[in-house]
């Protein structure tokens, strides 16, 4: 019957994905038992995305590669609500790479997934960005203004945040 075949397909997908993410945490979306949305364990979920806080210290380029081999990218922050969710899982004494860089040092900031950079939805600390040689963005905590973005040198190792679309099975 229909439900049996749906379950068989779901198990097949789970097996296929298992070599990349050994454990998935899934929830039923809405009332329809057909739709399960999943994030790898122990990633966190918000709206239609999954997030992973990488505590290994790496350069910006290596951090992005680390995310991409997992099927993700360094985080692209689209709304204040999304940033408010992300910071719940961050440590105040750490800095984390975002998927935001200015490769030419000309203040042409670009998101790694080609999402258009919108000046109206940015959360730079006051006075930032402030150095043309600092071409990668981090999010960190400043006691005076809480969480915000700062430009830093891309080769300086930092923690990072990966983001990917939820996995639907």
């Amino acid at each position: 019957n229909f439900m049996y075949s749906k379950t068989v397909k779901r198990l097949s997908k789970l097996r296929e994905y298992q070599q990349y993410h050994p454990s998935l945490t899934c929830v039923m979306e809405g009332k329809d038992i057909e739709d399960w949305s999943c994030c790898p364990t122990p990633w966190t979920s918000f709206q239609s995305s999954c997030y992973f806080i990488s505590t290994g210290m790496q350069s910006w380029t290596k951090s992005q590669k680390n995310c991409s081999v997992m099927g993700a990218d360094l985080v692209v922050i689209n709304t204040r609500e999304e940033q408010d969710f992300i910071i719940q899982n961050l440590k105040r004494n750490s800095s984390y790479f975002l998927g935001l860089s200015d490769p030419g040092g000309r203040r042409h900031w670009q998101w790694v997934d080609q999402t258009p950079y919108n000046e109206n939805v940015t959360f730079w600390h006051s006075g930032e960005p402030n150095n043309l040689d600092e071409r990668c963005a981090i999010i960190n905590f400043r006691s005076s203004e809480e969480w915000g973005w700062n430009d830093i040198h891309c080769h300086v190792p930092q923690k990072s945040i990966c983001k990917m679309k939820k996995i639907y099975i």
Epitope: E16, Y17, S68, G71, D73, V112, Q114
Partner: nanobody
Framework: QVQLQESGGGLVQAGDSLRLSCAAS????????MGWFRQAPGKEREFVAA????????NYRDSVKGRFTISRDNDLNAGYLQMNSLKPEDTAVYYC????????????????????WGQGTQVTVSS
């Protein structure tokens, strides 16, 4: 670990066609979205075309739309770039790239979104 090998490049006249191939090994090809990029002498590498892992979605840079077609055969672990009406400005080294994805329909246009790259194949278009 994924390995990629491009082939099919060469020297052609303006207006001619070429078909580039990208052979993949080392993992389940159908789990990877694919992109083609190119780098002309003295220029940065640029996005050319992308295809989702199922092959259902494609994306092209404006200057090749209507002339280039990206495709894939998941059974053969291969991707292709059919290039028609070639122009001198298409002269470059062409690279294929793969990235793991769990979406069957998403394409990726950012160079840094692809961790796996081939060595490239030279395409030269003379006028």
């Amino acid at each position: 670990q994924v390995q990629l090998q491009e082939s099919g490049g060469g020297l052609v006249q303006a207006g001619d066609s070429l078909r580039l191939s990208c052979a993949a090994s080392g993992d389940t090809f159908s789990m990877y979205a694919m992109g083609w990029f190119r780098q002309a002498p003295g220029k940065e590498r640029e996005f050319v075309a992308a295809i989702s892992r199922s092959g259902s979605s494609t994306n092209y840079r404006d200057s090749v739309k209507g002339r280039f077609t990206i495709s894939r055969d998941n059974d053969l672990n291969a991707g292709y770039l059919q290039m028609n009406s070639l122009k001198p400005e298409d002269t470059a080294v062409y690279y294929c790239a793969l990235r793991l994805t769990f979406s069957t329909t998403t394409t990726y246009t950012g160079e840094l979104q692809y961790p796996y790259w081939g060595q490239g194949t030279q395409v030269t278009v003379s006028s």
